[in-house]
Interface confidence: medium
């Protein structure tokens, strides 16, 4: 049943984030007469689709329609019927589908085709499903957090509307961690972006931004774990892999076919004379950290400085918002507080990883074992990536803000994507603003 309310002059938009591990649907809402103002769009709903990412449906594409049903029906309920036909729906697929496309364009197209046909059956204005590039994912994440933080607004406020605001117009950098890729995006300080592939130019609200971005495919937390396992089993030459990134007493059997299913492990692939191996956790943060560092090739850099794998990275500048899995993992580990130093985070990780698996299961009885078992790896991976991968230090750590939501909207690429596709971020500053921010924030 739909509530009969006075008609609001509002608009809605729907974006589906088809990630490597799952799909989420976001519903956004904004006052129709303020489309070009900054900070007016906000998220009213997030619906997490039950099941894996869409790339896992490659052998069962006929199930995609059912998979999307619950969340699309939820969108029907949330958005007034009168608005359905003018509500745009966008689906952006990220690194999981990029990897599938690397394996087979035909299979990736088949999945997207069925997704498009399923979404076209709803009464909304479906605008298409596509695999977005890593560069877009980084850029839209950067736009999202800075839009929500009010960084594009030319008005200087005497009050702060967001917890991270520094009351200046310096943009935040964006750090995004997914299951299959990770993005780093920021405005460097007076630094030439030495590789054209990593350079973006924006004009937003009358201001020019030269932005650095890079997406590291295969360095999302799930694919990084597969890489680490494939690398370690090479050396183990045994059906048992003692793994410092899992809790002492943890055991899990892994199929070699699953290990080599992803393009991310191709560089470590070898003929193993067993079909399965068993992970046995030994829970040692330091050894886990060392093992993870082997995934980053820092011996080669054709630029003045690099992140890893020969990818240019300018000197870090300003504050950074770290979101998606950066936030979810650190939130679980209770390490998102601004007051927790990098040294403290490392200490906490050492203690956490060393805790016996049986103890961990008892302490977190409500958490699915699949996820619970991987927090030691994920937390250690986040530290390794930020410190050794991106060259944050104990001092610059305090400039990283682990962000889940800003003003009720999730930090991530989806809002920036919709703002761009609906032309809601003007290149020039709007001439007049009918209402001051304080009336609608």
């Amino acid at each position: 049943t739909q509530n009969k309310a006075l008609p609001e002059n509002v608009k809605y938009g729907i974006v589906l984030d088809a990630g490597s591990s799952h799909t989420s649907l976001y519903i956004y809402k904004w006052p129709a007469e303020k489309e070009n103002d900054t900070g007016v769009v906000h998220q009213v709903e997030e619906c997490r689709v039950k099941g894996p990412g869409i790339s896992k449906f490659v052998q069962k594409v006929n199930e995609i329609g059912i998979y999307l049903t619950d969340c699309m029906e939820r969108a029907r309920e949330v958005i007034p019927r009168s608005q359905h036909q003018e509500t745009p729906v966008y689906l952006g697929a990220t690194a999981g589908m990029r990897l599938l496309r690397m394996e087979s364009e035909e299979l990736a197209d088949r999945v997207l085709d069925v997704v498009e046909r399923s979404l076209s059956n709803y009464p909304f204005d479906f605008q298409g499903a596509r695999i977005i590039t890593g560069q877009e994912e980084g850029a839209y994440g950067w736009i999202t957090i800075n839009y929500l933080l009010g960084k594009f607004s030319q008005k200087t406020r005497w009050f702060s509307i967001v917890p991270y605001e520094t009351n200046n117009q310096e943009t935040f950098g964006a750090l995004d961690l997914g299951g299959a890729s990770t993005q780093v995006t920021f405005v460097p300080q007076n630094q030439t972006i030495e590789s054209p592939d990593n350079a973006l130019q924006f004009r937003l609200y009358g201001k020019d931004y030269n932005v650095y971005t890079h997406s590291f495919l295969c360095y999302g937390k799930d694919q990084a774990l597969w890489q680490k396992l494939a690398k370690d089993i090479q050396v183990a030459s045994n059906e048992i892999l003692r793994d410092p990134c899992f809790h002492p007493g943890y055991k899990k059997v892994v199929n070699v076919s699953d290990l080599y299913k992803t393009p991310c492990t191709k560089r470590f692939e070898m003929t193993l004379p067993f079909q399965q191996f068993e992970i046995q956790g030994i829970g040692n943060y330091q050894q886990c950290h060392q093992s993870i560092l082997e995934l980053f090739n820092t011996s080669y850099c054709p630029y003045s400085q690099c992140a890893f794998n020969g990818i240019f990275l300018p000197p870090l500048q300003g504050d950074f918002g770290a979101f998606s899995a950066f936030y979810f993992v650190m939130k679980f580990l209770n390490l998102t507080s601004e007051k927790v130093s990098q040294e403290k985070v490392t200490e906490m990780m050492k203690k956490f990883c060393a805790q016996p698996w049986e103890e961990i299961k008892t302490s977190y009885a409500g958490v699915k074992e699949k996820y619970l078992s991987e927090y030691c790896f994920s937390g250690t991976y986040i530290l390794s990536l930020l410190l050794q991968g991106y060259h944050f230090t104990a001092d610059s750590w305090e400039h990283i803000h682990f962000i889940g939501k800003i003003q009720g909207s999730d930090a991530g690429w989806t809002l920036g994507y919709m703002l761009n596709l609906t032309n809601m971020i003007p290149a020039e500053q709007p001439l007049s603003t009918p209402l001051s921010h304080s009336t609608y924030v």
Epitope: V235, A236, S237, N238, E239, R242, Q287
Partner: antibody, heavy 119, light 107 residues
Framework: EVQLVESGGGLVKPGGSLKLSCAAS????????MHWVRQAPEKGLEWVAY????????YYADTVKGRFTISRDNAKNTLFLQMASLRSEDTAMYYC????????????WGQGTTLTVSS | DIQMTQSPSSLSASLGERVSLTCRAS??????LIWLQQKPGGTIKRLIY???TLDSGVPKRFSGSRSGSDYSLTISSLESEDFADYYC?????????FGGGTKLEIK
């Protein structure tokens, strides 16, 4: 307490055969890969062979390939090295050692058993 | 096969002295190296694994380090029980290969 005890060494004529054993105790033998390593008189250590925990992997040094066979009996916690077509250069002290990546790579060794190949 | 070149092959040193032994790998071994001590009776004991991790029960005067393809074992202050043979071993690939060994003797 982890213990590895080699046995079966002795004097053999060139071309002859012999089987060495390594009895393991104090740990879950079936979890560990096992190595044979040897040391000729007044020489350094030389790796000989490896067998994985479930016997699905075997590796050999080129010097013994085709002549030596590594095997194990997990029910009896015992490692074996069957040696055939023996040569004088096989004369050495033979050690067994256990192996499990990440932290147990050749972390415990037996005291060794001596093989002498001489006519 | 990966060659492990160990130096020096022998070393005379005094009690309390600091000594370093080195192994150079002919190919990248990514830190997969152990150091072993062999006492005159033939007993073999692992001291260090993963290039720099000290085994439990091994005195803190022993330490392992890496610089590129060079791996070092350092004894900060020699004690009488340290006079023995020392070997490095790479475990990144088969065949496993040992360094030629270093005989550490009392001066």
């Amino acid at each position: 307490e982890v213990q590895l005890v080699e046995s079966g060494g002795g004097l053999v004529k060139p071309g002859g055969s012999l089987k060495l054993s390594c009895a393991a105790s104090g740990f879950t033998f079936s979890d560990y890969g096992m190595h044979w390593v040897r040391q000729a008189p007044e020489k350094g250590l030389e790796w000989v062979a490896y067998i994985s925990s479930g016997s699905s992997i075997m590796y050999y040094a080129d010097t013994v390939k085709g002549r030596f066979t590594i095997s194990r009996d997990n029910a009896k916690n015992t490692l074996f090295l069957q040696m055939a077509s023996l040569r004088s250069e096989d004369t050495a002290m033979y050690y067994c050692a256990r192996d499990l990546y990440y932290d147990h790579v050749l972390d415990y060794w037996g005291q060794g058993t001596t093989l002498t190949v001489s006519s | 096969d990966i060659q492990m070149t160990q130096s020096p092959s022998s070393l005379s040193a005094s009690l309390g002295e600091r000594v370093s032994l080195t192994c150079r790998a002919s190919q990248e071994i990514r830190g997969y190296l152990i150091w072993l001590q062999q006492k005159p009776g033939g007993t073999i004991k692992r001291l260090i694994y993963a290039a720099s991790t000290l085994d439990s029960g091994v005195p803190k005067r022993f330490s392992g380090s890496r610089s590129g393809s060079d791996y070092s074992l350092t004894i900060s202050s020699l004690e009488s029980e340290d006079f023995a043979d020392y070997y490095c071993l790479q475990y990144t690939s088969y065949p496993r290969t040992f360094g030629g060994g270093t005989k550490l003797e009392i001066k």
